[in-house]
């Protein structure tokens, strides 16, 4: 019996079997499946990529092709050397043994193998043709590599020369600036020894004025002393007069009108010929009650009996009548004169009144009042200002009339309210008024936006705080 | 009688800005500081800042300074007040009201009827 | 800032009947409190001023009590247009400050 099967063994690879009797015969085929799918950039029937991926890809893939192509070329000489030794001997014992219908079988297989061949052939033209192809890219590829690597050699060279100017020319920098360190350093040394010769002057610069501080508070203490004793002198010499002169000797008089020892303001001692701004005591009217004050020598002329100052918030404004009335502070800081003496003095001769007002921005302004006095404190030392001029305002910002004197025991003001407590200071509040320069002091960046500060409405508005104020005195007459 | 009559309603959006307008009549415009406040749905009233028309001087509100803006025209008697860089936040009734007193902030005696300002984009 | 604080929240209380509501200050305030009262659609009107003193035309059933820290209001005799929310305010220090108020119905 006879008969032919076609079928696909496991490698997944055709096989042809052809059974004749006893003898069986199996032909393998050499499969296209080692040529890549389509899906393959470089599959055969497949477009050509513009360029390879990049050069080492292309020199592997190159490699891979002639290694399919040699497999190829050796399958098909096997192939015909098989067919040559084999199919000879068998075609002839085929001939002699087999019917004419296996012929027909041969003649199947025979034309399957040719075309198998036929196929192989064209494709193996197809990827002779890809290589020649894929070759003569890589060979225009290396040649452009040959140029740019000419000109990369060629940029390098003249980059080691740029290098080695450079390199010459740090060498010179770096001597430089070893040359100036030196120098510097000797600078340094210098200004090291200047430094401490400086140190040591401001040492002794410090202990000398520390000396000079004490000797001034010996010397204002002492000058307070001789004034004593001055004025004790000269109460002696006047009543050694008295005695040995009549009463109607005019000698006496005039020693009397000369060596004048007691002051009731800063005008008198100015005009005595002490014209230096300090401290001096001076006398009550109709009295010998003295009082520490501040005398303003150099604004306008000189003669100010400061009656008021603020400048740094070093002293509490927020005290009782009692306080106000006889004064507190520093006449050397802040401080405020009295309203017993003010009002005693104001009372008995025309006086001006100077405010004198800083901002916190380095702006100053001032309102001067032609006529001001204090009203007794029976009236709660009411004020009265008239004549108002000066830069820190066209309205005054002291009320008008004059509102009497309130503090935070001893409420006078016209508002519900008590004003000096809501407001903080003593003052002559209306209801509670445009000013109060005895407030709380507050310091920059803290002086606005409030409610109880050292406040001249008619100058900066109501919420803003100033930084210092000088109210001061002096007779009309001056 | 003494009125203080506010622009109408706005709507913004986020990130802009709007001037509301306050007309002070039946009293000296110059004579009392004038102060805004704003009312946020469901929110406590809020101080945002006052200005003393007689000298131009302002004080804001720590909370909106650097937004709002106080200004006054004295030849028309009006208030305006200015807040930029606006948030959803802000959308409330922004309201103008007069001081009892001049040269204080105290309490707040006449009020504008309120401007509603809404934020939303 | 000083904050003041409102209590009750809320108030229902009988016509003719007496309504308090409280007001406490985080400081000192002294007496620099003012009330106010808003009705719906309305800005708020001012009632009392430094703890205690009616403003103009304000009914006399409407009084203030208080200092330092610790204020009240007080409707003596409660009518139907009292119906509102009422604010306290402190005006003793910079910025102004208000409480969030008090809803007085009636009960």
């Known amino acids: 019996y006879s008969n032919f099967r076609k079928s696909v063994d496991s490698t997944g690879r055709r096989q042809y079997q052809v059974q004749n009797g006893p003898c069986s015969y199996t032909f393998l085929l050499p499969e296209t499946d080692s040529c890549r799918s389509s899906s393959s950039p470089y599959m055969s029937n497949a477009v050509q990529r513009d360029a390879p991926l990049d050069y080492d890809d292309s020199v592997q893939r190159l490699q891979v092709l002639e290694n399919i192509l040699e497999n190829n070329t050796q399958w098909l000489m096997k192939l015909e050397n098989y067919i040559q030794d084999n199919m000879k001997k068998e075609m002839v014992e085929i001939q002699q043994n087999v019917v004419q219908n296996q012929t027909a079988v041969m003649i199947e297989i025979g034309t399957s193998l040719l075309n198998q061949t036929a196929a192989q052939t064209r494709k193996l033209t197809d990827v002779e043709a890809q290589v020649l192809n894929q070759t003569t890219r890589l060979e225009l590829q290396l040649l452009q590599h040959s140029i740019s690597t000419n000109k990369l050699e060629k940029q390098i060279l003249d980059q080691t020369s740029e290098i080695n100017k450079l390199q010459n020319k740090n060498s010179f920098l770096e001597q430089k600036v070893l040359d100036m360190e030196g120098k510097h350093s000797e600078q340094l040394q210098s200004m090291k020894e200047q430094k401490d010769e400086l140190q040591v002057l401001v040492s002794k610069q410090s202990s000398v004025i520390d000396e000079l501080e004490k000797k001034l508070v010996t010397a204002t203490v002492n000058n307070s002393l001789l004034q004593k004793q001055q004025h004790d002198l000269m109460e002696t010499v006047n009543s050694l007069l008295t005695m040995m002169s009549s009463p109607n000797s005019k000698s006496s008089v005039a020693i009397r009108k000369e060596e004048q020892t007691t002051f009731r303001d800063c005008a008198e001692i100015f005009k005595s010929g002490l014209t230096t701004s300090g401290i001096y005591t001076l006398t009550f009217p109709n009295s010998t009650e003295e009082i520490k004050a501040y005398c303003d020598m150099d604004v306008g002329g000189g003669g100010w009996t400061v009656i008021q100052h603020r400048e740094d918030g070093s002293v509490d404004f927020q005290r009782t009548w009692k306080e106000y009335k006889e004064g507190f502070g520093s006449p050397l800081g802040e401080y405020w004169l009295g309203n017993e003496f003010v009002s005693q003095l104001t009372g008995q001769h025309r006086y001006v009144l100077k405010i004198q007002l800083k901002d916190w921005e380095g702006n100053e302004a001032h309102s001067l009042y032609d006529h001001f006095y204090l009203a007794g404190e029976e009236s709660n030392y009411r004020i009265h200002l008239t004549g108002l001029t000066g830069t820190a305002g066209k309205i005054s910002s002291i009320s008008q009339p004059g509102s009497d004197f309130s503090t935070k025991d001893s409420d006078n003001d016209k508002c519900i309210c008590k004003c000096s407590q809501m407001l903080s200071g003593g003052w002559w509040f209306d209801a509670c008024g445009p000013s109060n320069l005895n407030g709380q002091y507050y310091p920059q960046k803290q002086n606005t936006n409030k409610f109880n500060g050292i406040k001249w409405y008619y100058w900066k508005g109501s919420g803003y705080s100033l930084k210092a104020t000088t109210m001061m005195i002096r007779p009309a007459d001056f | 009688q003494v009125q203080l009559v506010q622009s109408g309603a706005e709507v913004k959006k986020p990130g802009s800005s709007v001037k509301v307008s306050c007309k002070a009549s039946g009293y000296s415009f110059t004579d009392y500081n004038m102060v805004w406040v704003r009312q946020a749905p469901g929110q406590c009233l809020e101080w945002m800042g006052y200005i003393d028309p007689y000298n131009g001087g302002t004080g804001y509100n720590q909370k909106f300074e650097g937004r709002v803006t106080i200004t006054a025209d004295e030849s028309t008697s009006t208030a305006y007040m200015e807040l930029s860089s606006l948030r959803s936040e802000d959308t409330a009734v922004y309201y103008c009201?007069?001081?009892?007193?001049?040269?204080?902030?105290?309490?707040?005696?006449?009020w504008g009827q309120g401007t509603l300002v809404t934020v939303s984009s | 800032d000083i904050v003041m604080t409102q209590s009750p929240d809320s108030l229902a209380v009988s016509l003719g009947e007496r309504a308090t509501i409280n007001c406490k200050a985080s400081?000192?305030?002294?007496?620099?409190v003012a009330w106010y009262q808003q009705k719906p659609g309305q800005p708020p009107k001012l009632l009392i001023y430094?703890?205690?003193t009616r403003d103009t035309g304000v009914p006399d059933r409407f009084s203030g009590s208080g200092s330092g820290t610790d204020f009240t209001l007080t409707i003596s005799s409660l009518q139907a247009e009292d119906v509102a929310v009422y604010y306290c305010?402190?005006?003793?220090?910079?910025?102004?400050?208000f409480g969030c108020g008090t809803k007085v119905e009636i009960k």
């Open positions: 400081q000192d305030v002294y007496i620099a």
């Open positions: 009201a007069r001081t009892r007193d001049r040269y204080d902030v105290w309490y707040f005696d006449v």
């Open positions: 430094w703890a205690s």
């Open positions: 305010h402190q005006y003793s220090s910079y910025p102004p400050t």
